[in-house]
Amino acid sequence: SITGISPITESLASLSTYNDQSITFALEDESYEIYVEDLKKDKKKDKVLLSYYESQHPSSESGDGVDGKMLMVTLSPTKDFWLQANNKEHSVELHKCEKPLPDQAFFVLHNRSFNCVSFECKTDPGVFIGVKDNHLALIKVDYSENLGSENILFKLSEILEHHHHHH
């Protein structure tokens, strides 16, 4: 369960892949599309509002009873829109929604390789946001593979602003 309904902190950042491609968001036919692309030098990176929430582990998972806590994150590139996992389609989509946000909008934050992050679906443990064919997709990660796969690694570049932006 998420501890409390308000985030413990928020930050504004641009999101890029392990290979330094930018994650961008474009409004097309009244819905948002998500792209993974090389940005032209003068093009500004898209910003994402990351809201961080604490969540208690189910004690059976963590082996440490009530002590175990996870850090969950929601990602919003523009007002009222959040990244969501579509587990049936193995896709990552932007949906307009109101709070309280659905579970599909929450991702467990992992630090994997040092100074890279990964986003694991709250609704589907072992499934991560990843890059596939220049798009974001849901990728199942085999824990025996040590979770090092570069296609699920992302870099966050903090932007010193505190208010939600509007596209």
């Epitope: 963590s62 082996g63 440490d64 175990g68 850090l71 992992h110 630090n111």
Partner: antibody
Framework: EVQLVESGGGLVQPGGSLRLSCAAS????????MYWVRQGPGKGLEGVSG????????YYTDSVKGRFTISRDNSKNTLFLQMNSLRAEDTAVYFC???????????????WGQGTLVTVSS | DIQMTQSPSSVSVSVGDRVTITCRAS???SSWLAWYQLKPGKAPKL??????SLQSGVPSRFSGSGSGTDFTLTISGLQPEDFAVYYC?????????FGGGTKVEIK
């Protein structure tokens, strides 16, 4: 109850080796980011080496790279720091610490051991 | 590496006083800052994480604030057991660097 107990410290000559252990109980070691931190005599805290829970990725501060190796034995729920080619400036109390959150170091380190003293001197 | 500049390096205060310790990061670290208390011969104790979240079991006289690059630890109504050395640590990116420490001593 979460507990971390370090051992393996002692007096060693420059160029020598030591292996520090950190026995963890009350939680699953592999689920958390673990970190070795040291405090030299009359000095502040310095992060030495870390290991990521889920990926097992490792980190070393520049001054120990190539000399120290962090590892863990999941079956024994124990963290290790193998210290080779020790120098006088490695003299310190070494603490092991566990992250607040199970998959990230963003929240800092909630549980610490009492520390083990490493003295490098001839 | 991110440099953490902590001030003052020491402060002499009386029981009941309010103490403010500041920490400045050399680059933006969002709210990823922790504060620790260290007493001789004891394990460091986490007081505040994520800049302002009070660690469970820590008295409410301890509070943290700030984001970006500037952060503050405040002890309101210092108690005898609060005389110790306090460290900030940026937990945003490796290496996870500490400030130089602030010694809070009895006046």
């Amino acid at each position: 109850e979460v507990q971390l107990v370090e051992s393996g410290g002692g007096l060693v000559q420059p160029g020598g080796s030591l292996r520090l252990s950190c026995a963890a109980s009350g939680f699953t070691l592999r689920s958390y980011v673990m970190y070795w931190v040291r405090q030299g005599p009359g000095k502040g805290l310095e992060g030495v080496s870390g290991i990521s829970g889920s990926s097992g990725g490792t980190y070393y501060t520049d001054s120990v790279k190539g000399r120290f190796t962090i590892s863990r034995d999941n079956s024994k729920n124990t963290l290790f720091l193998q210290m080779n080619s020790l120098r006088a400036e490695d003299t310190a109390v070494y603490f092991c610490a566990r992250s607040v959150y199970s998959t990230t170091w963003y929240g800092g380190f909630q549980h610490w051991g009492q520390g083990t003293l490493v003295t490098v001197s001839s | 590496d991110i440099q953490m500049t902590q001030s003052p390096s020491s402060v002499s205060v009386s029981v009941g006083d309010r103490v403010t310790i500041t920490c400045r990061a050399s680059q933006v670290i969002s709210s990823w800052l922790a504060w620790y208390q260290l007493k001789p011969g004891k394990a460091p104790k986490l007081l505040i994480y994520a800049a302002s979240s009070l660690q469970s079991g820590v008295p409410s006289r301890f509070s943290g604030s700030g984001s970006g690059t500037d952060f503050t630890l405040t002890i309101s109504g210092l108690q005898p057991e609060d005389f110790a050395v306090y460290y900030c640590q940026q937990t945003n990116s490796f290496p996870l660097t500490f400030g130089g420490g602030t010694k809070v001593e009895i006046k």
